[in-house]
């Protein structure tokens, strides 16, 4: 799996999970989240060469097509596969509220 | 939706469905499929600017992060959303066989 266990231990130019820390205030301009101040969002990036972690039959076909037709622009792309929620604390007036924001953290990647 | 109805009628640099015909023998080297000789596989390509058809909370956050940090390499990618199967005819010796290959045709795209 193209997850932290694999990607953070290997120097990998191909599609892999990359570390990314997002500071809510500085990077998104979000002042409404009280805690945490930021989080490890991570992201997916890298080349999707021949059959590298191909996700669907179509991405496999596209990968093949690209190998046989290297001048083609039709190639798979490195995107998130498994995502996890993030629990945040924010205030409605003086009332604290805990909320779970779905699909905020990328845990693994795929070529799709 | 970033499907044929929208994308094939509009000149769109942003993430959209693109036409791609794949000839099994010529483009993939597959001799085993008897019919069809090829098919409209399509593919997804184009930029994923701020909130353009963002798929998940994470891709929205990444899109926003990228807007505020334009030098960052962490940006969403244009990938397939809805896929459809393709029915093929092949031969096992002299005996014809019909098979449905799943996820072979891209019908729409998203930024993920």
């Amino acid at each position: 799996a193209l997850d932290a266990a694999y990607c953070f231990r290997n120097v990998q130019d191909n599609c892999c999970l990359r570390p990314l820390y997002i500071d809510f205030k500085r990077d998104l301009g979000w002042k409404w989240i009280h805690e945490p101040k930021g989080y490890n969002a991570n992201f997916c990036a890298g080349a999707c060469p021949y059959l590298w972690s191909s996700d669907t039959q179509h991405s496999r076909v596209l990968s093949l097509y690209n190998t046989i037709n290297p001048e083609a622009s039709a190639s798979p792309c490195c995107v998130s596969q498994d995502l996890e929620p993030l629990t945040i604390l924010y205030y409605i007036g003086k009332t604290p509220k805990i909320e779970q924001l779905s699909n905020m953290i990328v845990k693994s990647c795929k070529c799709s | 939706a970033l499907d044929a109805a929208y994308c094939f009628r509009n000149v769109q640099d942003n993430c959209c469905l693109r036409p791609l015909y794949i000839d099994f023998k010529r483009d993939l080297g597959w001799k085993w499929i008897h019919e069809p000789k090829g098919y409209n596989a399509n593919f997804c390509a184009g930029a994923c600017p701020y909130l353009w058809s963002s798929d998940t909370q994470h891709s929205r956050v990444l899109s926003l992060y990228n807007t505020i940090n334009p030098e960052a390499s962490a940006s969403p990618c244009c990938v397939s959303q809805d896929l459809e199967p393709l029915t093929i005819l092949y031969y096992i010796g002299k005996t014809p066989k019909i098979e449905q290959l799943s996820n072979m045709i891209v019908k729409s795209c998203k930024c993920s």
Partner: antibody, heavy 120, light 108 residues
């Protein structure tokens, strides 16, 4: 260069399973059907089945159906043949071979063979 | 399943002689579903002929295949020392693929 490289010889006990690998060069894996052939000591050739790697369509000989599983790993261009519930008569050299392109076809490139010995 | 019967079981000839190997099918294969292989001890089979009469790349012209329906022939026009081996025919018209029992070509 076209190559099919098979895993090393194995010794197994009756009732066990064996999984033989066949690593192929890229183009073979993309475009061809991979067949598996059994050759018992001093005997002839017996086709076990074939698999189309990219789409994972497998076709098995009736004699091996239920005991043999052919799979493909697209990340490593490797095809696998797993034979379960081994019997002493399964002692043989197992070959992987690429066909000329059809599901049933002549086989133009062959692996070096993997000897599987089943003995108690 | 289609049974292939090869004859003779053993063929003893000298280098320079002509070898004729026969393969008979229990049912008609049409004209293009038969292959011939050569196998030497400790080696994998090597494809010689496919489609009953087409020579595989790199196979010398002294090897030729003919036949259709149920009767097929492999001919080696002038035997070389390296041609002494076991020869198998294979049908791929129907599943399962089947092979003949082999013809051993030995030096006389």
């Amino acid at each position: 260069e076209v190559q099919l490289v098979q895993s090393a010889a194995e010794v197994k006990k009756p009732g066990a399973s064996v999984k033989v690998s066949c690593k192929t060069s890229g183009y073979i894996f993309i475009s061809n059907v991979i067949s598996w052939v059994q050759q018992a000591p001093g005997a002839g050739l017996e086709w076990m089945g074939g698999v189309i790697p990219i789409v994972d369509i497998a076709n098995y000989a009736q004699r091996f159906k239920g005991r043999v599983t052919l799979t493909a790993d697209t990340s490593t261009n490797t095809v696998y043949m797993e034979l379960s519930n081994l019997r002493t008569e399964d002692t043989a050299v197992y070959y992987c071979a690429s066909t000329l392109g059809l599901v049933l076809d002549a086989m133009d490139y062959w692996g070096q063979g993997t000897l599987v010995t089943v003995s108690s | 399943e289609t049974v292939l019967t090869q004859s003779p079981g053993t063929l003893s000839l000298s280098p320079g002689e002509r070898a004729t190997l026969s393969c008979r099918a229990s049912q008609s294969l049409g004209s293009s579903y038969l292959a011939w292989y050569q196998q030497k001890p400790g080696q994998a089979p090597r494809l010689l002929i496919y489609g009953a009469s087409s020579r595989a790349p790199g196979v010398p012209a002294r090897f030729s295949g003919s036949g259709s329906g149920t009767d097929f022939t492999l001919t080696i026009s002038s035997l070389e020392p390296e041609d002494f081996a076991v020869y198998y025919c294979q049908q791929y018209a129907d599943s399962p693929i089947t092979f003949g029992q082999g013809t051993k070509l030995e030096i006389k």
